[in-house]
Interface confidence: low
Amino acid sequence: QDSPPQILVHPQDQLFQGPGPARMSCQASGQPPPTIRWLLNGQPLSMVPPDPHHLLPDGTLLLLQPPARGHAHDGQALSTDLGVYTCEASNRLGTAVSRGARLSVAVLREDFQIQPRDMVAVVGEQFTLECGPPWGHPEPTVSWWKDGKPLALQPGRHTVSGGSLLMARAEKSDEGTYMCVATNSAGHRESRAARVSIQEPQDYTEPVELLAVRIQLENVTLLNPDPAEGPKPRPAVWLSWKVSGPAAPAQSYTALFRTQTAPGGQGAPWAEELLAGWQSAELGGLHWGQDYEFKVRPSSGRARGPDSNVLLLRLPEKV
């Protein structure tokens, strides 16, 4: 006898991966046998070329390529949502509507939230290589590569947390070039290569001569963006300074930088970054459209020398 339609198999949420196609299933009972119609975000699908949807005789919907999506701009979440599909089964006695099934696309953005930086570590001490993977759906996994090969993580010595690599005790063999790789079903992204140098510990007593060092910060120059870092990389500057006083008493130099506040306002706290050079070095991870103050500080072991003069640089809104 005749019966109204009833949905037996509801479409399920899908992740659109690779070249496709994605399949949405819908099966219904009813007498006379119901006809199946598919809707995307409540709108019926035309199924007429060049519509990428194709209906199979059993009611399965084939999606041959992802529907057109908007493109997120700088800093915006790339919505992974391609839409909600529902199927309707109809005969002369009525219509049954399935649950909605969400189709989302695998996404892996280009830009790393944090790029690993060149650094100098001391034998026996811990150091961290920071990496903030790009936003992705599904959430990307992070692996570390050293000198072009996957880094074999040693329990107790290596820890990966939130993408960053923590090395419990630096050894001379840890010297090399490190890269952070983010992977999900949309593909993989490689960070910049970060050079790690390992120094022997130098047991300086607090060197009085460090106090006699004079540093003149001579130049702060905005570097051209690295096109490999995506459409809008974070700006980087090149610092160059001159050292006078005792013969090379400083083991390392640190950049101190902060955004400038309005006149009379309380200054922002100084951020510190160990520099890889002894007379000039790159400093990255800044923000466009900010006024910055920069200075350089020498150090040996735990002793610090006097800070250099301060130079100002206004970073443009966008390059």
Partner: antibody
Amino acid sequence: QIQLQESGPGLVKPSQSLSLTCSVTGYSISSGSLWTWIRQFPGNNLEWMGYISYAGGIDYNPSLTSRISITRDTSRNQFFLQLESVTTQDTATYYCATPGGYPFHFDYWGQGTMVTVSS
Amino acid sequence: QPVLTQSPSASASLGASVKLTCTLNSQFSTYNIGWYQQHRDKPPKYVMFVKGDGGHSKADGIPDRFSGSSSGADRYLTISNIQAEDEAIYFCGADYNNAGQYGCVFGSGTHFTVL
């Protein structure tokens, strides 16, 4: 820089509809992200109400599904909240917000508009 | 959907440290959360993203005094060298996907007072 600004009546009578507008500057609402309404009750509790995505997809808080509607006007770069059959329990500060990186982690918020439901 | 539990209040002295806790119900113990700071008569401000594995990612302009961590179902926001301007309500929030329904829930907030 993305900026959001809520507008709408500050006083609504019980059983009537509450209608609010969120005007967005600095970014096209049809280009990306989830355009979201969140409200904060007088006791400070926050409640996610729902969103409309850049593609027009919507999701609502299950507790509000029967009386909420979120729509948009891409030509004016605005999205809207409509809440039917309001009661005094709907008295709250209403915010529009959008994520800046990870979905549902809201970097950008409007200043909020206080809506009182009272006869 | 997840339920996020926060203690109603916390306090600490100027210059000290405090660790605020947001606890997820057990079946959602691996979820990532976001922390928000809200000053009186202001909208909430996004502070950071804390992952289930303890990794965290701060929003632009958030001082280094703020850090995030995780243990089991607990997500932490630690504020060190507390300043007067840190006095605020701190909320945690988590997203979820329940049978294709996406959404977000918030904890009830912790009123943090600087002594």
